[in-house]
């Protein structure tokens, strides 16, 4: 792979990562594909500091992140360990709610209007955030 030493145009650098913030919406899987084709991944939040940074840029808008449980356990798209990692769920979330009437539960995580996380139907067209690390050789993101 090739190392990325500076952020692409229209991306924001923060703590040796580059972030791109959408202003339109897509389903979670399509947002994931978009980031991958940018040699990036949906944002993986690893600290309170990173949470505040992302929250500042997205504002009070539902926004997808790179966390899902479509195959059972919750997983970050870059392989970061979920169980031992940073979490910022809203109270009583995630709840895998089936009452929305859209079929199935809720398997994809997003930032809510106050920045805390909620699980929701993956087909909802929310905004999204892509992230790629600097000084790291580009490689294929892990498969879902």
């Amino acid at each position: 792979g090739s190392e990325r030493t500076c952020c692409p145009v229209n991306w924001v650098e923060h703590e040796r990562s580059c972030y791109w913030f959408s202003r339109s919406g897509k389903a979670w899987a399509d947002a994931d594909n978009y980031c991958r084709l940018e040699d990036a991944h949906l944002v993986v939040v690893t600290s309170w500091e990173e949470q505040k940074f992302v929250q500042h840029h997205i504002g009070p808008v539902n926004t997808w992140m790179g966390l899902h449980d479509q195959n059972g356990p919750w997983k970050w798209v870059d392989g970061t360990d979920y169980e031992t990692g940073f979490k910022n769920w809203r109270p009583e979330q995630p709840d895998d709610w089936y009452g929305h009437g859209l079929g199935g539960g809720e398997d994809c995580a997003h930032f809510t209007d106050d920045g805390r996380w909620n699980d929701d139907v993956c087909q909802r067209p929310y905004r999204w955030v892509c992230e790629t690390e600097l000084d790291k050789a580009s490689q294929e993101p892990p498969l879902l």
């Epitope: 792979g1 090739s2 692409p8 959408s22 202003r23 339109s24 919406g25 897509k26 389903a27 399509d30 594909n33 978009y34 991958r36 084709l37 940018e38 040699d39 067209p125 580009s138 490689q139 294929e140 993101p141």
Partner: antibody, heavy 121, light 108 residues
Framework: EVQLLESGGGLVQPGGSLRLSCAAS????????MNWVRQAPGKGLEWVSV????????YYADSVKGRFTISRDNSKNTLYLQMNSLRAEDTAVYYC??????????????WGRGTLVTVSS | DIQMTQSPSSLSASVGDRVTITCRAS??????LYWYQQKPGKAPKLLIY???SLQSGVPSRFSGSGSGTDFTLTISSLQPEDFATYYC??????????FGPGTKVDIK
Amino acid sequence: EVQLLESGGGLVQPGGSLRLSCAASGFTFSSYAMNWVRQAPGKGLEWVSVISGSGGSTYYADSVKGRFTISRDNSKNTLYLQMNSLRAEDTAVYYCAKRIAAAGTEYFDLWGRGTLVTVSS
Amino acid sequence: DIQMTQSPSSLSASVGDRVTITCRASQSISSYLYWYQQKPGKAPKLLIYAASSLQSGVPSRFSGSGSGTDFTLTISSLQPEDFATYYCQQSYSAPPFTFGPGTKVDIK
């Protein structure tokens, strides 16, 4: 000059293989995802495959999955399409096209002139 | 996958005519819609991106509109060089990037 130039097309028998190439110039090749789009004679456009700038992520149309492989060599500014188990319905002009991602949109702003692949016995 | 349809499949028009081509998506695609022009034996050329934005270098007689499922490409005053086939394409749910079947504009 900003351009894409395909090569490698030709006549091949059903079940055979062919490798197409697309030489890019005039832009930073490694910064862009690249696509193959095909057009059967007298028909419309059909997207075939896309590869990210680093080559790390690839996607395929269902019609070619498991038979075609997209790849790239950024040191040579070249995109490839390895086509195996070719069928008559793969007969088409194959275009390479540069993907632009702008404000969440994705479209093809630069196309090559195409190379014709004919699958026939 | 999202299906794209276009109407009409072909039309005959004269130089100076106002021409309208419609593209419809099988589900809402917001404004993730693009228009291309293709002349015989040539590669497609991007005209409109994000439903209504004119690509650099494209004449202002071309315009796009619509959002959701219904979109329109309009040529305000048809010129001789505009006789071609026009395709719409979506990227809302992609890959795959799906194209409409095309609309051929020929001389009346």
